[in-house]
């Protein structure tokens, strides 16, 4: 089941999927001056069996100017966009994306692909948030969003990340920064939020990406 909406946006933050659930589609978009080859796929699809998942179809771009070539054209100034990179705050041990069963890893780039990727997510997909450069997390609650199906409709959970540009915040005296609460989430909340363990895993995963591409567009 495809998710109806995009993941929620958080002020001064970006999001990214670390792995993509089976059923996810990625549009085969080409950069300006290029187009999909005739009879080429419209999208890539994450498919798999119980032991292995991979992307079906290949995206291929060809020059719009000449028919049967994939010769690179010099991009116009407005096309020479830098992909924004955001440094994560603390490096941790990597978590292998492929170790998540039923998920595909980030597809490798194809020649002359567009600067932004458009994904169509499915129920159960999780995306992770981080503050953009120049902002810091005032509150770092669960910094992820999950696409869930409730009452026959899809809905993304609301991430509880607050990013602030204010460097001077007051921390109350005599109190150390507490660790994340050890108790599990109460029953009333489990239908809407992932577990603390999942959050810890995602933090480790997210923190491995020292400089990540965060211009990806999700739909």
């Amino acid at each position: 089941e495809l998710c109806d909406d995009d993941p929620p946006e958080i002020p001064h933050a970006t999001f990214k999927a670390m792995a993509y659930k089976e059923g996810t589609m990625l549009n085969c978009e080409c950069k300006r001056g290029f187009r999909r080859i005739k009879s080429g796929s419209l999208y890539m699809l994450c498919t798999g069996n119980s032991s292995h998942s991979s992307w079906d179809n290949q995206c291929q771009c060809t020059s719009s100017a000449t028919r049967n070539t994939t010769k690179q054209v010099t991009p116009q100034p407005e096309e020479q966009k830098e992909r924004k990179t955001t440094e994560m705050q603390s490096p941790m041990q990597p978590v292998d994306q492929a170790s998540l069963p039923g998920h595909c890893r980030e597809p490798p780039p194809w020649e002359n692909e567009a600067t932004e990727r458009i994904y169509h997510f499915v129920v159960g997909q999780m995306v992770y948030y981080q503050c953009v450069q120049g902002y810091r997390a005032l509150h770092r609650g669960p910094a992820e969003s999950v696409c869930k199906m409730t009452h026959g409709k899809t809905r993304w959970t609301q991430p509880q990340l607050i990013c602030t540009g204010e460097m001077e915040t007051s921390q109350f005296p005599g109190e150390e920064k507490p660790q994340a609460s050890p108790e599990g989430r109460p029953e009333s909340e489990t239908s809407c939020l992932v577990t603390t363990t999942d959050f810890q895993i995602q933090t480790e995963m997210a923190a491995t990406m020292e400089t990540s591409i965060f211009t990806t567009e999700y739909q």
Epitope: H139, G141, T169, F172, P178, P186, S188
Partner: antibody
Framework: QVQLVQSGAEVKKPGASVKVSCKGS????????MHWVRQAPGQGLEWMGV????????IYAQKFQGRVTMTVDTSTSTAYMELSSLRSEDTAVYYC????????WGQGTTVTVSS | DIQMTQSPSSLSASVGDRVTITCRAS??????LEWYQQKPGKAPKLLVY???TLAEGVPSRFSGSGSGTDFTLTISSLQPEDFGTYYC?????????FGQGTKLEIK
């Protein structure tokens, strides 16, 4: 179910301080930041500030800077808002509200400042 | 600070009417906007978040739309229990300011 329960009404003299509490239950307290909002009689809503229940960091509205202190006690899942140097214009109902989208609110605490 | 301006400040409508309340931000706030309903003597209640997402348990006659600076809360068919004051609020940046409120009365 999620609940935010606030302390009872207070009557204070000008110049005094008041400390309002807000106890969260039915969810993991440190997952959600806590905002404080007040409403003077017959007036609209006014955002006072926000505190991270996880780190204790707080940001206050400029208007209250120097007079307000927000704290949390994670062992009791309680957030506090203390307002000092009270004046008659601080007479209002004070609310705590949870998370990025203020999805749950306390019932409100009436603070009356009168000589 | 970002100013939030609601209109109208009050309105009276009949049961079954379609009611629209607008909120304008003094600068672009993307879709970082919430709508709340408040009844006399009660705490506000979240209706819509992120401009268009209906909060859990809110009847489907309520809907939110808009992005950037102009936002709308619509009640498709007014019910007697919909009276009260409606507030918009942004969460783009601190301070998270509210609109001045729209008082809705049932004719």
């Amino acid at each position: 179910q999620v609940q935010l329960v606030q302390s009872g009404a207070e009557v204070k003299k000008p110049g005094a301080s008041v400390k309002v509490s807000c106890k969260g239950s039915g969810y993991t307290f440190t997952d959600y930041a806590m905002h404080w909002v007040r409403q003077a009689p017959g007036q609209g809503l006014e955002w006072m500030g926000v505190i991270s229940t996880y780190s204790g960091d707080a940001i206050y509205a400029q208007k209250f800077q120097g007079r307000v202190t927000m704290t949390v006690d994670t062992s009791t899942s309680t957030a506090y808002m203390e307002l000092s140097s009270l004046r008659s214009e601080d007479t209002a109902v004070y609310y705590c509200a949870r998370g990025v989208t203020f999805d749950y609110w306390g019932q409100g605490t009436t603070v009356t400042v009168s000589s | 600070d970002i100013q939030m301006t609601q209109s109208p400040s009050s309105l009276s409508a009949s049961v079954g009417d379609r009611v629209t309340i607008t909120c304008r931000a003094s600068q672009d706030i993307s879709n970082y906007l919430e709508w709340y309903q408040q009844k006399p003597g009660k705490a506000p209640k979240l209706l819509v978040y992120n401009a268009k997402t209906l909060a859990e348990g809110v009847p489907s006659r309520f809907s939110g739309s808009g992005s950037g600076t102009d936002f709308t809360l619509t009640i498709s068919s007014l019910q007697p229990e919909d009276f009260g004051t409606y507030y918009c609020q942004h969460h783009y940046d601190t301070p998270y300011t509210f609109g001045q409120g729209t008082k809705l009365e049932i004719k």
